[in-house]
Amino acid sequence: AITEAREEAKPYPLFPGPFPGSLQTDHTPLLSLPHASGYQPALMFSPTQPGRPHTGNVAIPQVTSVESKPLPPLAFKHTVGHIILSEHKGVKFNCSISVPNIYQDTTISWWKDGKELLGAHHAITQFYPDDEVTAIIASFSITSVQRSDNGSYICKMKINNEEIVSDPIYIEVQGLPHFTKQPESMNVTRNTAFNLTCQAVGPPEPVNIFWVQNSSRVNEQPEKSPSVLTVPGLTEMAVFSCEAHNDKGLTVSKGVQINIKAIPSPPTEVSIRNSTAHSILISWVPGFDGYSPFRNCSIQVKEADPLSNGSVMIFNTSALPHLYQIKQLQALANYSIGVSCMNEIGWSAVSPWILASTTEGAPSVAPLNVTVFLNESSDNVDIRWMKPPTKQQDGELVGYRISHVWQSAGISKELLEEVGQNGSRARISVQVHNATCTVRIAAVTRGGVGPFSDPVKIFIPAHGWVDYAPSSTPAPGNADPVLII
């Protein structure tokens, strides 16, 4: 049967009575050593009758005395079997054994839950020698017990390669409930059920759980640990905690906030990072996410021109990295830009609108209807064209660039001419006779040079030829016109 000793009990006697051989309470031990490294050498002296043996692991010595009497079996004496005490209290327990003095090499070690206790434990082994036996008392003390000290403690002694094991001493450290699982903060959908878990352990058991929501108990009846609370749904933020009760008192878990997912707040601080003729790079600071991660964002772009049709272009992008390059915009145009982001609940309102402008760009099309003809009287080539549509000029025209390439046998030379934006004709001097002149024209704005027109070729004959027809930009599909006069 287990002997229970509670913390308020009187100190346990080390033995049922004095040792045979008249060992008295004032009898000081011959040797008292602190327990270092788990093993303690025992010094043996003259034997007397050993104490009451236990039923555990017993060593039967094979050696006989001078009178050839067989020695009785060696065993640890019975001691208290179960010690119950509160956390942070001190405890001391011991093993005792009487060993015939003929054994010179004995060691006692302490074990807890099958593992040897080594090092800095408070273990002391005391030796009380008598004529034929030495009483050995191995004491183990813990000054302030913790839950981790719970367990089964035994002594082991080795004699002549035989192992003697004591009965276990069960240490049960009791205290307030200890949480092994506490509720976690969550973000939940409005009016949707969710679960919270709370688990606490003793000893002592049982541990009962009460749930608390916004300082009010959810259950007036205790629930055995572990407890799962199904919250039927919330319409507003709430704080939950759980109380764990046992015979020692109660422990309260951390309070956790349960937030209700909502649509996000609109983004703020939409700003222009960079503008080009056809794109605007914007950034924004996301608003509050409504307790639900952002999924994506929508950039809304409106032409700010009061004469525009007011249509809105929408560009969808990922929520990160709060940056987006809006493309396919017109050059030298004004736009209103707003940003909205969404989470699983829905879309935020649109951010405050900001105004942004694209810069001047190089024209996107070449001049049209390019015509070239030879004016032999002045030894010039006359070039005419139509300027590109205003929409596609992508800025204010500052002029044109004319490329004319002269090719004759084995010679090729390209010349560039810049002409002002007024007018749509130019005259260039003939550079080489008996050669082909290839002309291309590009419109120019402050944003750069636009694409060149398709090449128009004219043959410049040797001196003396009279009849010249113009050469012009071909109709589509006529790739390389050559006018030979």
Partner: antibody, heavy 118, light 105 residues
């Protein structure tokens, strides 16, 4: 299945005592609290109080302190409502109803009609 | 204690109609529960924790609300819905509303 079965109708004289029982079955009796609810003929519901079936501690609504007593016989999974010194106005139907979390009465007894008349 | 006021006291409807009854609390409550009581029977749990239907309650019933204002709605009334409906809170001391009697024409 879960059931709350109440004792039968009672006819009492003013000044007498009555004890109404509510026997629970189909669940662990000590897990759920037990409330008592009064309903006068043709009237609404009025909460009288409850008893903690785990600890046995009763709680009474303000209007039911004094002559009313809740008790338990846990081994029989039974809750009791005792009314002392009966008055004519105690004539009504009494319901037991169990609850756990969020104090929602998920099962009700069939009701016990008490008539107090001289 | 928290007083619950139900309106209307009597509600008449024809089968197929949508009806709503309300329950107002004298101060804010966390959850509202609703019970249905047919004449001569004990109350039955109908809606718990504001919006959750009790076992066996038809999906045409719904509950909503927060703070001090709660409601029970029947999307298409049927004759078997004729009963008295009580709201109930236990945020303070438990109280019941006076009931709304639903009559089917």
């Amino acid at each position: 299945q879960i059931q709350l079965v109440q004792s039968g109708p009672e006819l009492k004289k003013p000044g007498e005592t009555v004890k109404i029982s509510c026997k629970a079955s189909g669940y662990t009796f000590t897990t759920y609290g037990m409330s008592w609810v009064k309903q006068a003929p043709g009237k609404g519901l009025k909460w009288m109080g409850w008893i903690n079936t785990y600890s046995g501690v009763p709680t009474y609504a303000d209007d039911f302190k004094g002559r009313f007593a809740f008790s338990l016989e846990t081994s029989a999974s039974t809750a009791y409502l005792q009314i002392n010194t009966l008055k004519n106005e105690d004539t009504t139907t009494y319901f037991c109803a169990r609850f756990l979390r969020y104090y929602y009465f998920d099962y009700w007894g069939q009701g016990t009609t008490l008539t107090v008349s001289s | 204690q928290i007083v619950l006021s139900q309106s209307p006291v009597i509600l008449s409807a024809s089968p197929g109609e949508k009806v709503t009854m309300t329950c107002r609390a004298s101060s804010s409550v966390t959850y509202m529960h609703w019970y249905q009581q047919q004449p001569g029977s004990s109350p039955k749990p109908w809606i718990y924790a504001t919006s959750n239907l009790a076992s066996g309650v038809p999906a045409r019933f719904s509950g909503s609300g927060s703070g001090t204002s709660y409601s029970l709605t029947i999307s298409r009334v049927e004759t078997e819905d004729a009963a008295t409906y009580y709201c109930h809170q236990w945020s303070g001391n438990p109280t019941f509303g006076g009931g709304t009697k639903l009559e089917i024409n």
